[in-house]
């Protein structure tokens, strides 16, 4: 059930040409798990600069640092990776330049091509000393969480020792994992320890642990993989913008919404109005008034720009964007002064970062 | 796991309306538009009109526009397509599709008098 | 409304071979370009999405290329499973106009 009623018709035009919007795919940095990642902001003449990660306002914390233009990422997770913003806030304009983090292993598509060093995870021991099992190389198993674009070949590796020689099975999510589990199965390499799984699917998604054992004992490790999906996805919007604003009457007033998206945004600019003076018709919902939608006659949409206001262009402006996967929206309110008062501070014509959330 | 689910196959009278429904799972139901794209026998997709659950919102291929209405029950994650004033060339599989990335198996309409 | 033309609309290959399937549109479309293939009796599935870039759990072989008005899908290498009908979509603007497909029988 529709969530207001049109005053005017809002059926989708042939959207504006992508000049104004950053559609094409951004920049991609990757990072293995536990590295540090250091990004500068490609923009010039910043005065400020804030930063955003899907969309969300990034401040400074025990792993991110913000030194001027560059954005440090220390010790690197798989939650690290995401749709990054850096804008850069000038005296007349801003500016947003987006790039793509991403927290993966490389994991080889081959079939053991690298386990050059294979042969040394299988050890053997003196018939005599009897060992319960021990891992042989924890370095290989140090990255318990493996983020991994969907299609990609996983490898998860558990070499050890122990006298017998013992033997390794695998779970998944704590249950024993069969090759029907997966459509393809898997395939299990016990000389290197390892468990491969090719052209991986959301369903591959969980804990993998490998149990080693022999007479002697057990031991296991757990890793946890994610499949990351590739597929489109729906607007994002700038965190704090629009912003609130004020101004006098007969003033003029800037309302700025930057979009990102990775398919052609229809951007749409919304104000709650009167019919008949009444805010809500008789089906309850709020009467919306589109005041400008990207298209063919229209400049930069983005931007709402309003002239010579009066006190009824007070109240809230939604800035609301969609593409064929969904929609995004956002909203900034207006207050419009008498003359003789003057806006205060916080309530800067154009947007300024102090708003970003 | 994203699913769509649609209804069964249906048979109907020139003139009358059909109702397919296409029930999702799996996924946050509000956050993506429902595509409805048809298939007539020997032809090629043909794209209807989707529905955004959210909040209603919807667009229409004007060749339907007059004859198709697109709802979406947000208590069951179901959105329904109604077609009326069925003729022979309706005749056709139809799919739901959450984005064009995940679609539903298909739902043959048969009008036949 | 915005026209799709696929071409060929029929093609025969063998495995293992290289094929290329071109699609226009009627005016420029950004990029706003999307690939499905379909099986007879299924729905289809996304390929590309956004002219370029590949969905989930889509060998590499298939990739998109392509801007303005002119857009090619390509296999580097056909496998058995390849053969079906592919589609373009515009998906720039409603309506979201497919192309009349391209159906890659074995030679």
């Known amino acids: 059930r529709p969530s207001f009623s049109l005053v005017e018709d809002t059926t989708l035009e042939p959207e504006e040409p992508p000049t104004k919007y950053q559609i094409s795919q951004p920049e991609v940095y990757v990072a293995a798990p536990g590295e540090s990642l250091e990004v500068r902001c490609l923009l010039k003449d910043a005065a400020v600069i804030s930063w955003t990660k899907d969309g969300v306002h990034l401040g400074p914390n025990n792993r991110t640092v913000l030194i001027g233009e560059y954005l440090q990422i220390k010790g690197a997770t798989p939650r690290d990776s995401g749709l990054y913003a850096c804008t850069a806030s000038r005296t007349v304009d801003s500016e947003t330049w987006y790039f793509m983090v991403n927290v993966t292993d490389a994991i080889s598509s081959g079939d053991d091509e690298d386990d050059t060093d294979g042969a040394e995870d299988f050890v053997s021991e003196n018939s005599n000393n009897k060992r319960a099992p021990y891992w042989t190389n924890t370095e290989k198993m140090e990255k318990r969480l493996h983020a991994v674009p969907a299609a990609n070949t996983v490898k998860f590796r558990c070499p050890a020792g122990g006298n017998p020689m013992p033997t390794m099975r695998w779970l998944k999510n704590g249950k024993e994992f069969k090759q029907e589990h997966r459509i393809g199965g898997y395939k299990v390499r016990n000389q290197h320890w390892s468990l491969i799984m090719e052209s991986v699917v959301p369903s591959d998604k969980g804990n993998y642990t490998c149990v080693v054992e022999n007479e002697y004992g057990s031991i296991n490790h757990t890793y946890h993989l994610d499949v990351v999906e590739r597929s489109p996805h729906r607007p994002i919007l700038q965190a704090g913008l629009p912003a609130n604003a004020s101004t006098v009457v007969g003033g003029d007033v800037e309302f700025v919404c930057k979009v990102y998206s990775d398919a052609q945004p229809h951007i749409q600019w919304i104000k709650h109005v009167e019919k008949n003076g009444s805010k809500y018709g008789p089906d309850g919902l709020p009467y919306l008034k589109v005041l400008k939608h990207s298209g063919i006659n229209s400049s930069n949409a983005e931007v709402l720009a309003l002239f010579n206001v009066t006190e009824a262009d007070a109240g809230e402006y939604i800035c609301k964007v969609s593409n064929y996967i969904g929609q995004a929206n956002q909203s900034a309110w207006l207050t419009v002064l008498p003359k003789q008062q003057a806006p205060g501070r916080e309530k800067e014509i154009t947007a300024s970062p102090d708003y970003l959330e | 796991q994203v699913q769509l689910v649609q209804s069964g196959a249906e048979v109907k009278k020139p003139g009358a309306s059909v109702k397919v429904s296409c029930k999702a799972s799996?996924?946050?139901?509000?956050?993506?538009?429902i595509h409805w794209v048809r298939q007539a026998p020997g032809q090629g997709l043909e794209w209807m009109g989707a529905?955004?659950?959210?909040?209603?919102?919807?667009s229409y291929n004007q060749r339907f526009k007059v004859r198709a209405t697109l709802t979406a029950d947000t208590s069951t994650s179901t959105v329904y397509m109604e077609l009326s004033s069925l003729r022979s060339e309706d005749t056709a599989v139809y799919y739901c599709?959450?984005?064009?990335?995940?679609w539903g198996q298909g739902t043959t309409v048969t009008v036949s008098s | 409304d915005i026209q799709m033309t696929q071409s060929p609309s029929s093609l025969s290959a063998s495995v293992g071979d290289r094929v290329t399937i071109t699609c226009g549109a009627s005016e420029n479309i950004y990029g706003a370009l999307n690939w499905y293939q379909r099986k007879p009796g299924k729905a289809p599935k996304l390929l590309i999405y956004g002219a370029t870039n590949l969905a989930d759990g889509v060998p590499s072989r298939f990739s998109g290329s392509g801007s303005g008005t002119d857009y090619t899908l390509t296999i580097s290498s056909l496998q058995p499973e390849d053969f079906a009908t592919y589609y373009c979509?515009?998906?720039?603007?409603?309506?979201?106009?497919f192309g009349g497909g391209t159906k890659l029988e074995i030679k």
């Open positions: 529905i955004y659950p959210d909040n209603g919102d919807t």
């Open positions: 979509q515009n998906v720039l603007s409603t309506p979201y106009t």
């Open positions: 599709a959450r984005a064009f990335t995940y």
């Open positions: 799996g996924y946050t139901f509000t956050n993506y538009y």
